[in-house]
Interface confidence: medium
């Protein structure tokens, strides 16, 4: 039975340029975290698995670093980057846990944080 | 210089077990996941599992579970696997190779142990 | 699981010619990387990544692809480049490489 619930920093907005941190938090559970995908709609962004490591994909190389923790920054955000994001968590034995992120980057300076939520 | 030697061929009855060897050197073992590959005579590559040597962590392709075993010594630099209940299906060439985990890959190879399973 | 299916098995080309090199994967395949193995010796890295051309591989080589279908090509055939070459993928929690494609030389 999946008991755990993944906190995540729920619907934020950036500005054009700058960076963010993408955070998902897996708990009440007591299951082994196995690797984490950071997916963009069908995209992958990254993966931290416990035993290979962290990987990010080519395509993002230049611009998606790894942490804190099982997060990722994305730098230099463009407005293209507004959209959906994902924390996979494969665990064992309770086996996959998703959170989403929207994600929105703004022209202007009035970006601001949105409220964290969870997702059962 | 990165380096991968693997124990010699190895000729063994059917039923048997054998453990062959991978000493690494020219880097710390610990740091890096080693995988293991099959390869028949004639034939593809098929991978079998891996370990990480920092917390002996391991996992096996299904084919492989209970036929393969993945274990390290770090004092010796050196990886492990031992294959059970031999029949001529596991007669091939067992490579072990390093993981590289900036492109996801394997980057070296060692040179392979052929093992020969004959009454 | 990722299924990786490499064609030609078996190709012939004269130095000079152009060759390509196909792996088809049954769903959308993550981190492909390409192997080559010369008879009697182990595999060595090829190209990562789809398109990263490991240390030493000559600039004739080059890779391409996304999505379920990637490729391997050589623009002009060397003589050193018979050889067999095996696409792999690693996908949670799996690692699989194509049945290989054998290069010869015509």
């Known amino acids: 039975m999946m008991t755990g619930t993944i906190e995540t920093t729920g619907n934020i907005s950036a500005e054009k340029g700058g960076s963010i941190i993408l955070q998902c938090h897996l708990s009440s559970t007591t299951a082994q975290v196995t690797q984490v995908n950071w997916e963009q709609q069908d995209q992958l962004l990254a993966i931290c698995n416990a035993d290979l490591g962290w990987h990010i994909s080519p395509s993002f190389k230049d611009r998606v670093a790894p942490g804190p923790g099982l997060g990722l920054t994305l730098q230099s955000l463009t407005v293209n980057d507004t959209g959906e994001y994902f924390c996979i968590y494969h665990t064992y034995p309770d086996g996959t846990y998703t959170g989403r992120i929207f994600l929105e980057v703004l022209e202007s300076s009035v970006a601001e944080h949105g409220a964290r939520f969870q997702i059962p | 210089e990165v380096q991968l030697q693997q124990s010699g061929p190895e000729l063994v009855k059917p039923g048997a077990s054998v453990k062959m060897s991978c000493k690494a050197s020219g880097y710390t073992i610990t740091s890096y996941v080693m995988h293991w590959v099959k390869q028949k005579p004639g034939q593809g590559l098929e991978w079998i599992g891996y370990i990480n040597p920092y917390n002996d962590g391991t996992k096996y392709n299904e084919k492989f579970k209970g036929k393969a075993t993945l274990t390290s010594d770090k004092s010796s630099s050196t990886a492990y696997m031992e294959l059970s209940s031999l029949t001529s299906e596991d007669s091939a060439v067992y490579y072990c190779?390093?993981?590289?985990?900036?492109?996801?890959?394997?980057?070296?190879w060692g040179q392979g142990t052929s093992v020969t399973v004959s009454s | 699981e990722v299924v990786l299916t490499q064609s030609p098995a078996i190709t012939a080309a004269s130095l000079g010619q152009k060759v390509t090199i196909t792996c088809s994967a049954n769903s959308s395949a993550r981190y492909v990387h390409w192997y080559q193995q010369k008879s009697g010796t182990s595999p060595k890295p090829w190209i990562y990544?789809?398109?990263k051309l490991a240390s030493g591989v000559p600039a004739r080589f080059s890779g391409s692809g996304s999505g379920t279908s990637y490729s391997l090509t050589i623009s002009s055939m060397g003589a050193e480049d018979a050889a067999i070459y095996y696409c792999q993928q690693w996908n949670y929690p799996l690692i699989t490489f194509g049945a290989g494609t054998k290069l010869e030389i015509k």
């Open positions: 190779a390093r993981w590289n985990p900036y492109y996801y890959a394997m980057d070296y």
């Open positions: 990544e789809i398109s």
